[in-house]
């Protein structure tokens, strides 16, 4: 009888999922550029200042930094130009460019944003002669919302982009923590799914009963992530075990005080090319 693979596909899946914080911080499908422009999405209320950060990969001897907005016809409208701590005269004073002390980061701020400031923004750098070079940053989106009277429950704009080293640290630590937590969780799940490992008995032909709520117990909501359909890749066909559980395993992740979400089916093999969670994927591994 061939040996079962046990939890290894799950462990591997967890390690893959451990990279998610990195994806969330910086989407890999944004091509690398000598210029970065962050945050990729910024929301402010009208009247507030909206600040993007344009960062140069290195600091050339002489360069001009331009700040653009994409027009409805997809043309770049220049908002401000900056060189050697000088901003071009005669421009709209609402558009400010400030060089930060590290020399390579620039704050590009719209003072008292208006609703019609919503749109796509980017920065561009011209490295001056003798080595003339023109670079453009990825685009970023600004949404200016109408001012509401009640204070917002969440801060209106995402925090500024983390610096490279700090970002790496956050990704690493978060990945390890998420990995460890999920390993513990999956160990518990495995113990429940393969009870013979703990009880020495074979329980076949029945699924776990759904969680029952006692009359005086606090309500427990389940977030059901549906079936994880593992496609086992056996090198040699295995004779059917007389008492082997079905190759479909169910994982129920329990969060107290949360409404249940509909189940979702995912194949474990599809995790191999895992992508960052798309907006419609909801909160992913973390409760909202």
């Amino acid at each position: 009888m061939g040996s079962r693979r046990g939890p290894w596909p799950l462990v591997w899946a967890v390690l893959q999922l451990g990279w998610w914080p990195g994806w969330l911080l910086d989407s890999p499908d944004r091509p690398w550029s000598p210029l970065t422009f962050s945050p990729a999405q910024l929301t402010v209320q009208e009247g507030e200042n909206a600040t993007f950060t344009c960062s140069l990969a290195d600091i050339p001897d002489s360069f001009v930094l331009n700040w653009y907005r994409l027009s409805p016809r997809n043309q770049t409208d220049k908002l401000a130009a900056f060189q050697e701590d000088r901003i071009e005269p005669g421009r709209d004073r609402r558009f400010r460019v400030t060089r930060l002390p590290n020399g390579r980061d620039f704050h590009m701020s719209i003072v008292a944003a208006r609703l019609n400031d919503s749109g796509i923004y980017l920065c561009g750098a011209i490295y001056l002669p003798p080595n003339t070079q023109i670079n453009e940053s990825p685009r970023a989106e600004l949404s200016v919302t109408e001012r509401t009277l009640e204070p917002p429950t969440q801060s209106p704009s995402p925090p500024p982009r983390l610096s490279g080293q700090l970002q790496g640290l956050v990704i690493g630590v978060t990945s390890v923590l998420v990995g460890v937590l999920l390993l513990l969780l999956l160990t518990w799940v495995l113990a429940a799914v393969f009870p013979r490992a703990t009880r020495g008995a074979c329980v076949c032909g029945s699924e776990d009963e759904p969680l029952k709520e006692g009359p005086d117990a606090a309500p427990v909501f389940t977030l059901d992530y549906g079936e994880l359909d593992f496609q086992w890749r056996e090198k040699t066909p295995e004779p059917p075990a007389p008492c082997a559980p079905e190759q479909t395993e169910y994982a129920t992740i329990v969060f107290p005080g949360r409404p249940a979400s509909p189940g979702r089916r995912a194949s474990a093999s599809s995790l191999q090319g895992a992508q960052p969670p798309s907006p419609e994927d909801g909160p992913g591994l973390w409760p909202p």
Partner: antibody
């Protein structure tokens, strides 16, 4: 290599409007750069008039009678100077700068415009 | 506007001899960022002006090291260590610290 070539009338009557065009070849007229007009009056120095860079910025000495525009599709930019007087007789240069200050890297050959009745 | 005053207005030099042109600004061209925005241009007969020096002392690509710029604040000098026939023309100083950008009246350099 980038070349700039001014074109327009060599003779303008007083009170008329001067229209000059600068055709750019070997490169694009885009708002990345600063597309300037400078003039040189007889026995005088150089006089910066203004630039286009997606928007315009003018020397206050010409404010109210100057207009600089660009046609990025036709790859040229233009100067209009109204209410011409004999004092506006000069060689007019179009030029490109990579910043707004006098960091000009390409100049046209210049065109002599005489204001006379 | 900042007024740029050049002296002398004309200069006649023998080939191989040095030459210097002075330029005085009506106010300091030193910016708070530490840069001084003073430029030198040369216009050869029948040609457009070309920049030689930027920010007081930086030579543009292709400019021979016979040309050097110096000075600070309001007073600046362009020096040619050994004048050659090709150096004939009108030399202009210009400022880029305050809009509008202004230029000197020019110094005509001729060869004896």
């Amino acid at each position: 290599d980038l070349t700039l070539q001014e074109s327009g009338p060599g003779l303008v009557k007083p009170s008329q409007t001067l229209s000059l065009t600068c055709v750019v070849s070997g490169g694009s007229v885009t708002n990345i750069f600063y597309w300037n007009w400078i003039r040189q009056r007889p026995n005088r120095g150089l006089e910066w008039m203004g630039y286009w860079s997606g928007y315009t910025h003018y020397n206050p000495a010409f404010q109210g009678r100057i207009s600089i525009d660009a046609d990025t599709a036709q790859n040229h930019f233009s100067l209009q100077l109204s209410s011409m007087t004999t004092e506006d007789t000069a060689v007019y240069y179009c030029l490109r700068g990579y910043i707004w200050t006098p960091d000009y890297d390409y100049w046209g050959q210049g065109i002599l415009v005489t204001v006379s009745s | 506007d900042i007024v740029m005053t050049q002296t002398p207005l004309s200069l006649s030099v023998s080939p191989g001899e040095p030459a210097s042109i002075a330029c005085k600004a009506s106010q300091s061209l030193l910016h708070s960022n530490g840069n001084t925005y003073l430029y030198w241009f040369r216009q050869k007969p029948g040609q457009s002006p070309q920049r030689l020096i930027y920010k007081v002392s930086n030579r543009d690509p292709g400019v021979p090291d016979r040309f050097s710029g110096s000075g600070s604040g309001t007073d600046f000098t362009l020096r040619i260590t050994r004048v050659e026939a090709d150096d004939a023309g009108v030399y202009y100083c210009g400022q880029g610290i305050q809009d509008p950008w202004t230029f000197g009246a020019g110094t005509k350099v001729g060869l004896k």
